[in-house]
Amino acid sequence: MKVLQEPTCVSDYMSISTCEWKMNGPTNCSTELRLLYQLVFLLSEAHTCIPENNGGAGCVCHLLMDDVVSADNYTLDLWAGQQLLWKGSFKPSEHVKPRAPGNLTVHTNVSDTLLLTWSNPYPPDNYLYNHLTYAVNIWSENDPADFRIYNVTYLEPSLRIAASTLKSGISYRARVRAWAQCYNTTWSEWSPSTKWHNSYREPFEQH
């Protein structure tokens, strides 16, 4: 049994780090493998993560963590029984993938303006809470070419757009994702999408 692709890990900078790797053949990850992780710190103890299958030869492990600080560094040991397959380290603050925003809502009752709001996925005491920026994706269910991205570079989790920038009388979907420049994070996953029917009054034309 050998590791084909070494574990790579990302942290949500809150409570979970996710490590993925590939074995050289089909593996029952949860019964055959264990990922041990330990904070490099005085009087810390090793903790065990039981991996799950992620495709035939792929494994994924969700490492439970305390709140993350930038100094944290972990040793990682991948074991198959008594055999050490791989040894590495992981610094969560250098591999951050934010949590996805939630509760995306489209408010359509504001005089021909669409107001999209969503929730910041972090509690106020988390460092990332005040450092997220967002991308909002809006697309038409009827027309694949009608696909747009709005970058929200301010902190408030909301976006206002004129309903008239979209076509009237058809359904649209929206989703949102987040990233944090301060830690040069990757983008989060997209939030679940939300759907609405776009309709607005055409301005009365005078001849």
Partner: antibody, heavy 125, light 112 residues
């Protein structure tokens, strides 16, 4: 009420051995690291050794490394210090102390917040 | 090893007056914001040491509020706002950031 009670001290000749015990009550013993600190007559405090709650992490002062062994029995709520090849300079009052919570991912530290009354070790011929 | 240096080593104080003890470490004891692994202990004559301050500035349970700790990195201070007769004894700073834990030499506080 948290209590730490050391025992096992006494008079021993140079090169001899002693085993100190520290019996604990009043907190979840297995969750906490434990430490031994000593104080030679008329001197300051000197850290000796520490052990994690699960017993997997062990640390020693250079002055005792290879001669002293720290261990714990979580079923008996007791931490031990086995002292071999004792020297005159090991003469001291030995205290055990409750250390940080070590079972969390990052150990939670609240100082050495409870100490035993101490047990005296005298190494002399 | 991290070397801890206390000053002064002797501190005569009039009751009711403030007192201050300095502790310097040879390496930073800061792990992350709010986590300086520096404690202060008081050992009264014939007694075991007792914890006063942990993580640089957190007062231990039952410790009077006249005791306070401050500082970060390598420079720390223990202050007693108004010394009382029962405060006499030896004060030690200790780092628990890296093994081996190391103590300062101790400061003897006595009443004038």
């Amino acid at each position: 009420e948290v209590q730490l009670v050391e025992s096992g001290g006494g008079l021993v000749q140079p090169g001899g051995s002693l085993r100190l015990s520290c019996a604990v009550s009043g907190f979840t013993f297995s969750s906490y690291a434990m430490s031994w600190v000593r104080q030679a007559p008329g001197k300051g405090l000197e850290w000796v050794s520490s052990i994690t709650g699960g017993g997997g992490g062990i640390y020693y002062a250079d002055s005792v490394k290879g001669r002293f062994t720290i261990s714990r029995d979580n079923s008996k709520n007791t931490v031990y210090l086995q002292m071999n090849s004792l020297r005159a300079e090991d003469t001291a009052v030995y205290y055990c102390a409750k250390d940080r919570i070590s079972i969390t991912i990052r150990p939670r530290y609240f100082g050495l917040d409870f100490w035993g009354q101490g047990t005296t070790v005298t190494v002399s011929s | 090893d991290i070397v801890m240096t206390q000053s002064p080593l002797s501190l005569p104080v009039t009751p009711g007056e403030p007192a201050s003890i300095s502790c310097r470490s040879s390496q930073s004891l800061l792990y992350s914001i709010g986590y300086n692994y520096l404690d202060w202990y008081l050992q009264k004559s014939g007694q075991s040491p007792q914890l006063l301050i942990y993580l640089g500035s957190n007062r231990a349970s039952g410790v009077p509020d006249r005791f306070s700790g401050s500082g970060s990195g390598t420079d720390f201070t223990l202050k007693i706002s108004r010394v009382e007769a029962e405060d006499v004894g030896f004060y030690y700073c200790m780092q628990s950031f890296k093994a081996p834990y190391t103590f300062g030499q101790g400061t003897k506080l006595e009443i004038k």
